[in-house]
C-alpha cells in the first residue's frame, strides 16, 4: 500500500501517512523559578511544569532540565507566552524630571540547541521597552511560529530578567510545541 | 487495514488515520456586544459572529450562546485576539499629579467549561496594565496554545471590561480553535 | 480504498487522506526593506527572506514579490510578528505639556489578495497606540489565526510605517503560513 494512492489528481507522491494523535506534543506551564547560577550577558532559561494541571508532554516529546527534547524530525509549531510584572522603573522617574532615558526592557527568546552545533539558535524573540509610571505594571509577550527541527534538537525559553516573570498562574506564562 | 502499516521503522503503533479536512474547526469574529447581566467579580463573556465574513464553523464544531462546543476529544490549538480601546484612564491623571496609582488593566481569559466539573478552567490569560496618557489608546492582547479537550467541553472568551472591546472590525477581535 | 474505512464509530466519511509532510508551508523572515513607491492611505507591504537562515517555503508554497502564493485550497494557520522601534513621538512631548493628543500608532495587517476579487481582504489586524516617553521605544505586534483560503490566493503583510520596522534580526519580525 503506497502513500500515493491517496494523492489528488496531480499525482504528487506523499510521505508515509501518520495518525495525528501520535504526534509529539507538549504544553508546559510556569512554576516558581529556583535559584541557579546566572552567567553575565546570557539570558537565563525558565524551567517548567510538565505534568500537573494544564501541562502535558506526549508521544516521546520529553521535558528535562529546562529543555523540550524533539524526538522526531519535522515541522513544529512552537509558542510561548511570558507575563512580566514589576514596579515603577527608574526610567519613569528620570523621564518625569524631563530627561528621557534609554528605557528598561523585557525580552523573551525561544532558543534551539543542537548538540552538533556550537551556538544556540534564536528562533523567536519578543522584546519590548518598558517605561511605566504606575506603581505596578504587568504585561505579556507572546510568540509563536513554525520551524523545521531535527530529532535531538532541544528547545528552551530564555528571558531578559527572570526576577520579573509572573509565576503565579499556569495560564499566564507557558511554553509549547507540536509536530505539524 | 491497520494503522501501523504506515509506521516508520521504529514500528510505533498509530491510532486510526484521519483526513485533515474533516477536523472540527472554527474562527469566530467580533460583533457589537449586547447588554447582558454581569456578575460581580466575574469577567463577562464575549459573543461572536460564526458564519458571516471571515467567520466559520465546520465539521461539527458548533457555536452557541457565547460558547464553542467541542465535538470530539483531542488536542486543540485555541487562540484569540481582543483589541481594546479607551480614553485616558484615571491612572494617568493621578500619576500626572505625582501620585503613582495601581494601574488600570485589561485582561482576556480563554475559559473551558466542563459540565461535569463545577468550576470553569482558565486555559489562557493575557493581562496588561494600562496607564496611558494620550486621549485615545488602543491595543490588542493575543493568546494561543494547545490543550487536551474532551467531547462536550465548551470554550468562551472572557474580558475584564466588555465596554472597552473594539467591535468595529472582524480582523481586530477574534476567537478560534482547531483539532490538531 | 475509501476514506471512510478509517472513520470512527459514527461512520463519518472522510476526505482523502493526506501525509502531513507534504503540506504547503512557509516561514519568512525580515530583511532590510528596499525603497518602493507607497500610495497614500495604503499601508506598504513588507518583503521577506524565504530561503536563508530560518526561512523556508516548501510543498508548492511559493514566495514572490512580497506575496505568499497559496497552492492549494484549504484551511491555513497564518501568523506574523512585526517588531517596531522608534524614538520619542511628538505625542509624548505634547502630552507632557498637558495637552493630550491623538496618539501615534503602529499597525500590522495580514492581507489576502484574490485575483478574481477587486478588493484585498484584511484577515488580521494588530494595532496599538504608541505614546512613549523614553528616548527609544520598541515593541512587537503578534498575529495568528486560521482562515479558509483558495488556490491562487496571495498573502502579504502590511504595516503602518515601514520605516519603524525592526529588520535587524530574523527572530524579531517574521511571517508564516501552513495548511492544516
Amino acid at each position: 500500500l503506497k502513500g500515493q494512492e491517496f494523492a489528488p489528481s496531480h499525482q504528487q507522491v506523499y510521505a508515509p501517512l501518520r495518525a495525528d494523535g501520535d504526534k509529539p506534543r507538549a504544553h508546559l506551564t510556569v512554576v516558581r523559578q529556583t535559584p541557579t547560577q546566572h552567567f553575565k550577558n546570557q539570558f537565563p532559561a525558565l524551567h517548567w511544569e510538565h505534568e500537573l494541571g494544564l501541562a502535558f508532554t506526549k508521544n516521546r516529546m520529553n521535558y528535562t532540565n529546562k529543555f523540550l527534547l524533539i524526538p522526531e524530525s519535522g515541522d513544529y509549531f512552537i509558542y510561548s507566552q511570558v507575563t512580566f510584572r514589576g514596579m515603577t522603573s527608574e526610567c519613569s522617574e528620570i523621564r518625569q524630571a524631563g530627561r528621557p532615558n534609554k528605557p528598561d526592557s523585557i525580552t523573551v527568546v525561544i532558543t534551539k540547541v543542537t548538540d552538533s552545533y556550537p551556538e544556540p539558535t534564536q528562533l523567536l524573540m519578543g522584546t519590548k521597552s518598558v517605561c511605566e509610571v504606575g506603581s505596578n505594571w504587568f504585561q505579556p509577550i507572546y510568540l509563536g511560529a513554525m520551524f523545521s527541527l531535527q530529532e535531538g534538537d532541544k528547545l528552551m525559553v530564555n528571558v531578559s530578567d527572570i526576577s520579573l516573570v509572573d509565576y503565579t498562574k499556569e495560564d499566564k506564562t507557558f511554553f509549547g510545541a507540536f509536530l505539524l | 487495514l491497520k494503522g501501523q502499516e504506515f509506521a516508520p521503522s521504529h514500528q510505533q503503533v498509530y491510532a486510526p488515520l484521519r483526513a485533515d479536512g474533516d477536523k472540527p474547526r472554527a474562527h469566530l469574529t467580533v460583533v457589537r456586544q449586547t447588554p447582558t447581566q454581569h456578575f460581580k467579580n466575574q469577567f463577562p463573556a464575549l459573543h461572536w459572529e460564526h458564519e458571516l465574513g471571515l467567520a466559520f464553523t465546520k465539521n461539527r464544531m458548533n457555536y452557541t450562546n457565547k460558547f464553542l462546543l467541542i465535538p470530539e476529544s483531542g488536542d486543540y490549538f485555541i487562540y484569540s485576539q481582543v483589541t481594546f480601546r479607551g480614553m485616558t484612564s484615571e491612572c494617568s491623571e493621578i500619576r500626572q499629579a505625582g501620585r503613582p496609582n495601581k494601574p488600570d488593566s485589561i485582561t482576556v481569559v480563554i475559559t473551558k467549561v466542563t459540565d461535569s466539573y463545577p468550576e470553569p478552567t482558565q486555559l489562557l490569560m493575557g493581562t496588561k496594565s494600562v496607564c496611558e496618557v494620550g486621549s485615545n489608546w488602543f491595543q490588542p492582547i493575543y493568546l494561543g496554545a494547545m490543550f487536551s479537550l474532551q467531547e462536550g467541553d465548551k470554550l468562551m472568551v472572557n474580558v475584564s471590561d466588555i465596554s472597552l472591546v473594539d467591535y468595529t472590525k472582524e480582523d481586530k477581535t477574534f476567537f478560534g480553535a482547531f483539532l490538531l | 480504498l475509501k476514506g471512510q474505512e478509517f472513520a470512527p464509530s459514527h461512520q463519518q466519511v472522510y476526505a482523502p487522506l493526506r501525509a502531513d509532510g507534504d503540506k504547503p508551508r512557509a516561514h519568512l523572515t525580515v530583511v532590510r526593506q528596499t525603497p518602493t513607491q507607497h500610495f497614500k492611505n495604503q499601508f506598504p507591504a513588507l518583503h521577506w527572506e524565504h530561503e536563508l537562515g530560518l526561512a523556508f517555503t516548501k510543498n508548492r508554497m511559493n514566495y514572490t514579490n512580497k506575496f505568499l502564493l497559496i497552492p492549494e485550497s484549504g484551511d491555513y494557520f497564518i501568523y506574523s510578528q512585526v517588531t517596531f522601534r522608534g524614538m520619542t513621538s511628538e505625542c509624548s512631548e505634547i502630552r507632557q505639556a498637558g495637552r493630550p493628543n491623538k496618539p501615534d500608532s503602529i499597525t500590522v495587517v495580514i492581507t489576502k489578495v484574490t485575483d478574481s476579487y477587486p478588493e484585498p481582504t484584511q484577515l488580521l489586524m494588530g494595532t496599538k497606540s504608541v505614546c512613549e516617553v523614553g528616548s527609544n521605544w520598541f515593541q512587537p505586534i503578534y498575529l495568528g489565526a486560521m482562515f479558509s483560503l483558495q488556490e491562487g490566493d496571495k498573502l502579504m503583510v502590511n504595516v503602518s510605517d515601514i520605516s519603524l520596522v525592526d529588520y535587524t534580526k530574523e527572530d524579531k519580525t517574521f511571517f508564516g503560513a501552513f495548511l492544516l
Epitope: R32, H38, R85, G86, S135, N136, I162, S163, L164, K169 | - | -
Partner: antibody, heavy 120, light 107 residues
Framework: QVQLVESGGGVVQPGRSLRLSCAAS????????MHWVRQAPGKGLEWVAV????????YYADSVKGRFTISRDNSKNTLYLQMNSLRAEDTAVYYC?????????????WGQGTLVTVSS | DIQMTQSPSTLSASVGDRVTITCRAS??????LAWYQQKPGKAPKLLIY???SLESGVPSRFSGSGSGTEFTLTISSLQPDDFATYYC?????????FGGGTKVEIK
C-alpha cells in the same frame, strides 16, 4: 547554614544620612533577591525595598522612594541600604531578608536587625 | 496597595489549645500568602508560604489554609514556644504588604 548580619544602625539627626550593610553567608548570594524590611518600635512589619539577584531591578516603598537606595555587591556577598534625608518616622529596626528568584515573593531568612533612631 | 487585615489582634490561649488566626486581603491574592512568627527582640521566622506549604524545619502543628481573600493559620496544639506575634504577608502584587499582627499570649 544561612546567615544574615546587619550593621550600620545608630542614632542620627533628621535630614542626615546613614548606610546599612547586611553580610550574607551560607548560600549563593548572587542567586537571590534581597529585601529590607523595617519595624517601628511596638509596631508591625513594613517592607522597604528589594533588589533583584543581579542588581538590575530595585523597587521601593512609596514612603522611602527618592530618599533610600538599595544596592548589592555580589563579589562581597553584601547588601546595602543608603538612607538619605532621614525623618523621625524612619526610626525602626531594619532587617535584611532573603527573598527568592522573583523579586515579589516570600522571605525565608531574616537577619537579627539593626536599630536606626532618627532624633534631634 | 493590597491591605492585609489580621484578626484578632490579641489572642489569649493555654498550652494544648487549638489556635486559629485569620488574615483577610482587600482583594484576591490567590494562594500567594506567607505566615511569620516573631518573638520579642528577635527577627521574624517563616512558617508557611504559598498559603499552605510548611517551611522546612517548622513543626507540623502549624498549618495554613485558604485562598482568594480569606486565610487562616492554625496551631493544632499550642506549645510554650509558640507564644509570639504572628504576621501574614501577601506577595501577589507590588508592594508586598503585611498584616498588622496577632499576638498570642498566655491565658
Amino acid at each position: 547554614q544561612v546567615q544574615l548580619v546587619e550593621s550600620g544602625g545608630g542614632v542620627v539627626q533628621p535630614g542626615r544620612s546613614l548606610r546599612l550593610s547586611c553580610a550574607a553567608s551560607g548560600f549563593t548570594f548572587s542567586s537571590y533577591a534581597m529585601h529590607w524590611v523595617r519595624q517601628a518600635p511596638g509596631k508591625g512589619l513594613e517592607w522597604v525595598a528589594v533588589i533583584s539577584y543581579d542588581g538590575s531591578n530595585k523597587y521601593y516603598a512609596d514612603s522611602v522612594k527618592g530618599r533610600f537606595t538599595i544596592s548589592r555587591d555580589n563579589s562581597k556577598n553584601t547588601l546595602y541600604l543608603q538612607m538619605n534625608s532621614l525623618r523621625a518616622e524612619d526610626t525602626a529596626v531594619y532587617y535584611c531578608a532573603r527573598g527568592q528568584v522573583a523579586i515579589l515573593d516570600y522571605f525565608d531568612y531574616w537577619g537579627q536587625g539593626t536599630l536606626v533612631t532618627v532624633s534631634s | 496597595d493590597i491591605q492585609m487585615t489580621q484578626s484578632p489582634s490579641t489572642l489569649s490561649a493555654s498550652v494544648g489549645d487549638r489556635v486559629t488566626i485569620t488574615c483577610r486581603a482587600s482583594q484576591s491574592i490567590s494562594s500567594w500568602l506567607a505566615w511569620y512568627q516573631q518573638k520579642p527582640g528577635k527577627a521574624p521566622k517563616l512558617l508557611i508560604y504559598d498559603a499552605s506549604s510548611l517551611e522546612s524545619g517548622v513543626p507540623s502543628r502549624f498549618s495554613g489554609s485558604g485562598s482568594g481573600t480569606e486565610f487562616t493559620l492554625t496551631i493544632s496544639s499550642l506549645q510554650p514556644d509558640d507564644f509570639a506575634t504572628y504576621y501574614c504577608q501577601q506577595y501577589n502584587s507590588y508592594p508586598p504588604t503585611f498584616g498588622g499582627g496577632t499576638k498570642v499570649e498566655i491565658k
